[in-house]
Interface confidence: low
C-alpha cells in the first residue's frame, strides 16, 4: 500500500454579472486551505442567462428574476450540496442599470428587489445585489486581469513569494453601455475621482481608472443610429443593401441619445434606414462621439476627462476582444498594428451586405453593426485614449486568462470575500494539486 494524498477541500463563490445586454453567472473555486495565495482562485463553470439584461425588464421586474432561475438551478448542480450554505453569492449590475437608475430610479429599485427576492430563495450565502459604480467596474476588471496573470505576487522556486518585476497590466473593458480604462500610474491623478489606491499582498498600487457611460458598444450603436437619422437619412456604417425599419421611440428612449432627440419627434414613427457602405462618412460619424475641445487638466483623453499618458502593457477584453476577433477570425484581416486595425475597419465598412454575408456565412447576429463597432474601437484607442503605434503594440485582446473569463466579476468576489489580503504573505510552501 502507499499513502494517497487526498485533494484539498474546495470552496466556491458565485457572481452574477448583470450587464446591459445580458447576465452571466460565474462560479469560482479555490482550495480551502490556500485562500490567501495568489492565482489560486479559478473559474469552475459559467452560465449565460437567456434574454436581455436585467435593466431590460424595467416594465416587468419579476421577469428579471425569473430569467435568472435557469442559471441558479445549474449552480445547485455545479456546487456540491455540502458547500451550498458556505458559498457566497453576489449580483453586481453595471452600466445598463446605472442608466436605468438615472432615468427611472423606481424601476431600477424594483428590478433589484425582485432579483434579491429570488436570490434569497436559494441555499447559497446571498450577500446582496447592487449597482457597481463605473470606478468599481474598472478597478475590479484590472484586479481580475492581474490576479489571473499572477502580476501581484508569484511563488518562486526558492520557496518564497515575490513581486514579479514585469509590473501590472492595464485593463480596458468595452461593455454594452459603458467602457472602462484602468492602469497603474506613478504620478498622482489631477482629478482625484480617477484615482484609486490599493493595498494588495503588502504592495501599494496607485491606479488611474475612468468609466465612460454611454460609450459601451450597444449605446454607441444607438447614438450612431440617432446621428445617422439626424444628419444623413442613411447609415454610412451599415452595408449597402442592408435596410431596416427604425422605431424612433426605440432610438431616443436611452438617456445616451437624449442630446440628439428632436424636440417634437413622434415616438411611434418608423423610419426606413438603409446602409451606404461609406467608411469615410462612417469615420466622421464615429468621430462625432468624441469631444476634444476643452480640457481643464494638463492633459485629457476626451470629453474633458483627465487621463495620464497610457503606460505599459494592456489587456483589452469583452467587446474589445469580440470586435478584434471578428476582424481577425471571421474577416481574416491582420490587426497587429493601429494602421492595420484602421485598414481592417475600412475594409469591413467597404463591404456590401451581400459581400459581408458571403464572407461571414451563417448570418451572424448584428453583422451589419461590425463596421461601426470596428471603427469605434479604432477611434477610441487611437484618438480617445491616445495609443500610438508603440503603445498599441503592448495591447493584447483576450477573453480568458488561465481558463477564467476576464472581467470585473472575479475581482469583485476576491475583494468582497477578502481573498486578496492587504498584508504580505509569509514564507509558505507551494503545493501542486494538479
Amino acid at each position: 500500500t502507499r499513502d494517497v494524498r487526498e485533494p484539498p477541500a474546495l470552496k466556491y463563490g458565485i457572481v452574477l454579472d448583470a450587464g446591459s445586454s445580458h447576465t452571466s453567472m460565474f462560479i469560482y473555486k479555490w482550495p480551502a486551505d490556500k485562500e490567501n495565495d495568489t492565482g489560486i482562485v479559478g473559474q469552475h463553470s459559467s452560465c449565460d442567462v437567456p434574454g436581455g439584461g436585467i435593466s431590460s425588464y424595467a416594465d416587468n421586474p419579476s421577469g428579471a428574476s425569473q430569467s435568472l432561475v435557469g442559471c441558479l438551478e445549474q449552480a445547485l448542480q455545479d456546487v456540491p450540496k455540502e458547500r451550498h450554505a458556505g458559498t457566497p453569492l453576489y449580483l453586481g449590475a453595471t452600466a445598463g442599470m446605472r442608466l436605468l437608475n438615472l432615468t427611472n430610479p423606481e424601476a431600477s429599485t424594483s428590478v433589484l428587489m425582485a432579483v434579491t427576492h429570488t436570490l434569497t430563495q436559494y441555499p447559497f450565502d446571498f450577500r446582496g445585489a447592487r449597482i457597481l459604480s463605473g470606478q468599481e467596474e474598472g478597478v475590479f476588471g484590472w484586479v481580475t486581469a492581474n490576479y489571473l496573470l499572477e502580476n501581484f505576487i508569484k511563488y518562486g522556486w526558492v520557496g518564497r513569494w515575490f513581486r514579479p518585476r514585469k509590473g501590472t497590466l492595464g485593463a480596458m473593458d468595452l461593455g454594452g453601455a459603458s467602457t472602462q480604462i484602468t492602469f497603474e500610474t506613478t504620478s498622482p491623478a489631477e482629478d482625484r475621482a480617477s484615482e484609486v489606491q490599493l493595498h494588495l499582498y503588502g504592495q501599494h498600487y496607485r491606479v488611474y481608472t475612468h468609466s465612460f457611460l454611454c460609450y459601451g458598444r450597444d449605446q454607441v450603436l444607438q447614438r450612431l443610429l440617432a446621428s445617422a437619422l439626424q444628419t444623413h437619412g442613411f447609415h454610412p456604417c451599415w452595408p449597402r443593401g442592408f435596410s431596416t425599419q427604425v422605431l424612433l421611440g426605440d432610438v431616443y428612449q436611452s438617456p445616451c441619445t437624449m442630446a440628439q432627440r428632436p424636440q417634437n419627434f413622434n415616438s411611434s414613427a418608423r423610419v426606413s434606414l438603409s446602409g451606404s457602405s461609406d467608411p469615410h462618412l462612417c469615420r466622421d460619424l464615429v468621430s462625432g462621439l468624441f469631444s476634444f475641445s476643452s480640457c481643464p487638466f494638463s492633459r485629457c483623453s476626451f470629453n474633458g476627462v483627465f487621463q495620464p499618458p497610457v503606460a505599459g502593457n494592456f489587456v483589452a477584453f469583452s467587446a474589445f476582444f469580440y470586435t478584434v476577433d471578428f476582424l481577425r477570425t471571421s474577416m481574416g484581416l491582420p490587426v497587429a498594428t493601429l494602421q492595420q486595425l484602421e485598414a481592417a475597419a475600412v475594409n469591413v465598412c467597404n463591404q456590401t451586405w451581400a459581400q459581408l454575408q458571403a464572407r461571414v456565412p451563417g448570418q451572424r447576429a448584428r453583422l451589419a453593426d461590425y463596421c461601426a463597432g470596428a471603427m469605434f474601437v479604432q477611434q477610441l484607442l487611437s484618438r480617445g485614449y491616445g495609443f500610438d503605434e508603440r503603445a498599441f503594440g503592448g495591447v493584447i485582446f483576450q477573453k480568458k486568462a488561465a481558463d477564467t473569463a476576464v472581467g470585473w466579476a472575479l475581482g469583485y468576489m476576491l475583494n468582497l470575500t477578502n481573498l486578496i489580503p492587504a498584508d504580505p504573505p509569509g514564507l509558505r510552501k507551494g503545493t501542486d494539486f494538479s
Epitope: 445580458h22 437567456p50 416594465d59 432561475v69 425599419q245 426605440d250
Partner: antibody
Framework: QVQLVQSGAEVVKPGASVKISCKAS????????MDWVKQAPGQRLEWIGD????????TYNQQFKGKATITVDKSASTAYMELSSLRSEDTAVYYC??????????????????WGQGTLVTVSS | EIVLTQSPATLSASPGERITLSCSAS?????IHWYQQKPGQAPRLLIY???NLASGIPARFSGSGSGTFYTLTISSVEPEDAAVYYC?????????FGGGTKLEIK
C-alpha cells in the same frame, strides 16, 4: 423542418383529468421554452403557461394555477400538459407553441414562432 | 392584466383592396405581435415586434404603432388572406391576446 405534433382529440368526463402531449422535432428541444395556449369556442386565445425544458422550470398564468401542470420528457423531446378537475368550461382546443426570441439592443423580444396543430379536449358527461 | 381590444370584429374586403386592422391596449405596451389563423388551423406568426415580417410572410403585410395603439395593414388583399387576425402582447405578464378580427373576402 421545425415541427410540433400534438396528441389526438380527447373526450373526458367532468372531474376527470387528461394529459396531452406535444412532440418536437427539427430543432434542439432544450434550447427553447414551450408554451401552452387555450382556445375555447368563440373565445380569445389565452396563455396558460410555459416550461423551460433545459431546467424543468414552469411558469403559469395565475388563472390556470392548479388547473394545468406542464412537464417535459427531454429524452423524447416531448412536452406534456395535464389538465385536472375538468369542467365544461375547459372544453377547448389546446395548442403547444415554441417560444422564439431575439435580442435587439439588449431588449429581449419573445413570440410564438411555431405552433402545434392543436388538441381538442371535450368535457362531457 | 393588459386587455387588447381589436377592431373591427369583422371586416369584409375585395381582392386588391388596402385594409387596416387595429389593436388597442388598456395600458402602454412595448411591442405587439400579429398572428393569422385560418379555419381549422393553428395560428401562425405573421409579424413580430410590431413591424418585423415573420419568415415566409408576403411583403403586403406590414405593422406599425406604439404605446397603446397598433395596426396591421394589408396593402393589397388576396383571397388567401381570409382568416382571423390576433394581436398579442408580451410586454406585461400575463401575456394576452386580442379578441381577433375576422377578415372575409368578397
Amino acid at each position: 423542418q421545425v415541427q410540433l405534433v400534438q396528441s389526438g382529440a380527447e373526450v373526458v368526463k367532468p372531474g376527470a383529468s387528461v394529459k396531452i402531449s406535444c412532440k418536437a422535432s427539427g430543432y434542439t428541444f432544450t434550447d427553447y421554452n414551450m408554451d401552452w395556449v387555450k382556445q375555447a369556442p368563440g373565445q380569445r386565445l389565452e396563455w396558460i403557461g410555459d416550461i423551460n425544458p433545459k431546467y424543468d422550470i414552469s411558469t403559469y398564468n395565475q388563472q390556470f394555477k392548479g388547473k394545468a401542470t406542464i412537464t417535459v420528457d427531454k429524452s423524447a423531446s416531448t412536452a406534456y400538459m395535464e389538465l385536472s378537475s375538468l369542467r365544461s368550461e375547459d372544453t377547448a382546443v389546446y395548442y403547444c407553441a415554441r417560444r422564439g426570441f431575439f435580442l435587439y439592443y439588449g431588449i429581449n423580444y419573445y413570440y410564438f414562432d411555431v405552433w402545434g396543430q392543436g388538441t381538442l379536449v371535450t368535457v362531457s358527461s | 392584466e393588459i386587455v387588447l381590444t381589436q377592431s373591427p370584429a369583422t371586416l369584409s374586403a375585395s381582392p386588391g383592396e388596402r385594409i387596416t386592422l387595429s389593436c388597442s391596449a388598456s395600458s402602454s405596451v412595448s411591442y405587439i405581435h400579429w398572428y393569422q389563423q385560418k379555419p381549422g388551423q393553428a395560428p401562425r406568426l405573421l409579424i413580430y415586434s410590431t413591424s418585423n415580417l415573420a419568415s415566409g410572410i408576403p411583403a403586403r403585410f406590414s405593422g406599425s404603432g406604439s404605446g397603446t395603439f397598433y395596426t396591421l395593414t394589408i396593402s393589397s388583399v388576396e383571397p388567401e388572406d381570409a382568416a382571423v387576425y390576433y394581436c398579442h402582447q408580451w410586454s406585461s405578464y400575463p401575456w394576452t391576446f386580442g379578441g381577433g378580427t375576422k377578415l372575409e373576402i368578397k
